[in-house]
């Protein structure tokens, strides 16, 4: 069953800067992604951005930058101008649509601050990032090597002395990173008994998507929702690569050849999806 994960991050350096990451785990081609806040698409939410795999992105304040991270995940940077930092208690929702198969939506938010006395942004959670861990590890090896060389030199010049132990400084990078449980509401087109899955996703994002894809805002019209079921098993994002097999779109900025005065057809360059025509009236 396809699932959607949502992760909300707060920058440690800029507490007013937030990033929402969303990803789609499952088969099928993504035709549109809608990001909203304050609730799901069509249930009181306010749209922040829409991303289309080929046609581009559209965004609305306070969204700062929406982009594709991979073929199956997106990120949205938000700038919180208000002093009260409303993002800290806001729910962000992502809907992945695959027309006409169905759509799946999940929501997540920053977890509440561990200190009840704190009012606005939650305390950043210390997380040792992989790149810093590598640097620290390398530094440790170098320090140890230098210390050992000094030890050997001293042994040659003087009588053996007790072995020196190099002191290591251990630092951690602060990144406020909340992996929010995301409730995926699957709206399968012909399946009125679709399931809703709750899952957690670790912070793995694959290679960046070429040239930022785009999407559009629309009236929210949903397929029937099904009963909810929850699970606590972590879902890994890496390796769950979903190719966008939509033959009806062209790359942003390119105009495909017209097969008629107003009907535009697109070569099926991304997979078995059949070629589709776009509206031809201008």
């Amino acid at each position: 069953t396809p699932e959607v994960w949502v992760q909300v991050q707060m920058e440690a350096t800029e507490l007013s800067s937030f990033t929402v990451h969303c990803g789609f785990l499952g088969p099928g081609s993504i035709s549109l992604v809608t990001v909203s806040w304050g609730g799901p698409d069509g249930a009181g939410g306010t749209k922040l951005a829409v991303l289309h795999p080929e046609l581009g992105t559209r965004q609305w304040a306070p969204a700062r930058q929406a982009r594709w991270e991979t073929q199956s995940s997106i990120s949205l940077a938000l700038e919180d101008s208000g002093a009260s930092s409303p993002f800290a208690n806001t729910t962000f929702c992502c809907k992945f649509a695959s027309f006409p198969e169905g759509s799946w939506e999940s929501c997540g938010s920053l977890p509440p601050s561990s200190d009840p006395g704190l009012s606005a942004p939650p305390t950043p959670v210390p997380i040792l990032r992989a790149d810093l861990a590598g640097i620290l590890g390398l530094s440790g090896v170098l320090l140890f090597g230098c210390g050992y060389l000094l030890h050997l030199l001293r042994r040659q010049k003087h009588r053996p002395t007790p072995r020196l132990q190099p002191s290591h400084t251990n630092s951690q990078a602060l990144t406020a990173q909340a992996w929010a449980p995301s409730q995926a509401s699957q709206a399968a087109l012909h399946d009125p008994y679709a399931t809703i899955n709750t899952s957690f996703c670790p912070a793995t994002l694959d290679t960046a998507h070429p040239n930022g894809w785009a999407s559009l805002p629309t009236h929210a019209a949903h397929q029937p929702q099904g009963p909810a079921a929850s699970a606590s098993t972590p879902i890994l994002a890496r390796g769950s690569f979903v190719s966008v097999e939509n033959g009806l779109y062209t790359q942003a900025g390119e105009r495909p050849p017209h097969t008629g005065p107003g009907l535009t057809l697109f070569p099926d360059c991304r997979g078995p999806r059949a070629v589709e025509g776009r509206f031809g009236v201008r």
Partner: nanobody, 121 residues
Framework: EVQLVESGGGLVQPGGSLRLSCAAS????????MGWFRQAPGKGLEGVAH???????RYVDSVKGRFTISQDHAKNSLYLQMNSLRAEDTAVYYC???????????????WGQGTMVTVSS
Amino acid sequence: EVQLVESGGGLVQPGGSLRLSCAASGYTFSTDCMGWFRQAPGKGLEGVAHIDSDGIPRYVDSVKGRFTISQDHAKNSLYLQMNSLRAEDTAVYYCVVGFKFDEDYCAPNDWGQGTMVTVSS
């Protein structure tokens, strides 16, 4: 809960007419466009017609002059009047609500379950 419900499909002879209806409910987002897509048996999806937020209708070439798209804002409904139907119009027709990335295309964000239109003698 957002819902788009199509109706009006059925079997019709070549040259005949049908009127498809789409009742929309539950959405809160502002939208760019509403329209109709279709998928013929064994074929890909095709945008048939859509109406922009400014009320301008747009059609694919193959239906120009035969199909008319219209809206009733009071009823939150969308219609597709199909005249001079041909065998090649046989398809499942989907009502969609979507976003515009360019003037020619209404990218579906939500859609109904579809209604079958069969044109056959």
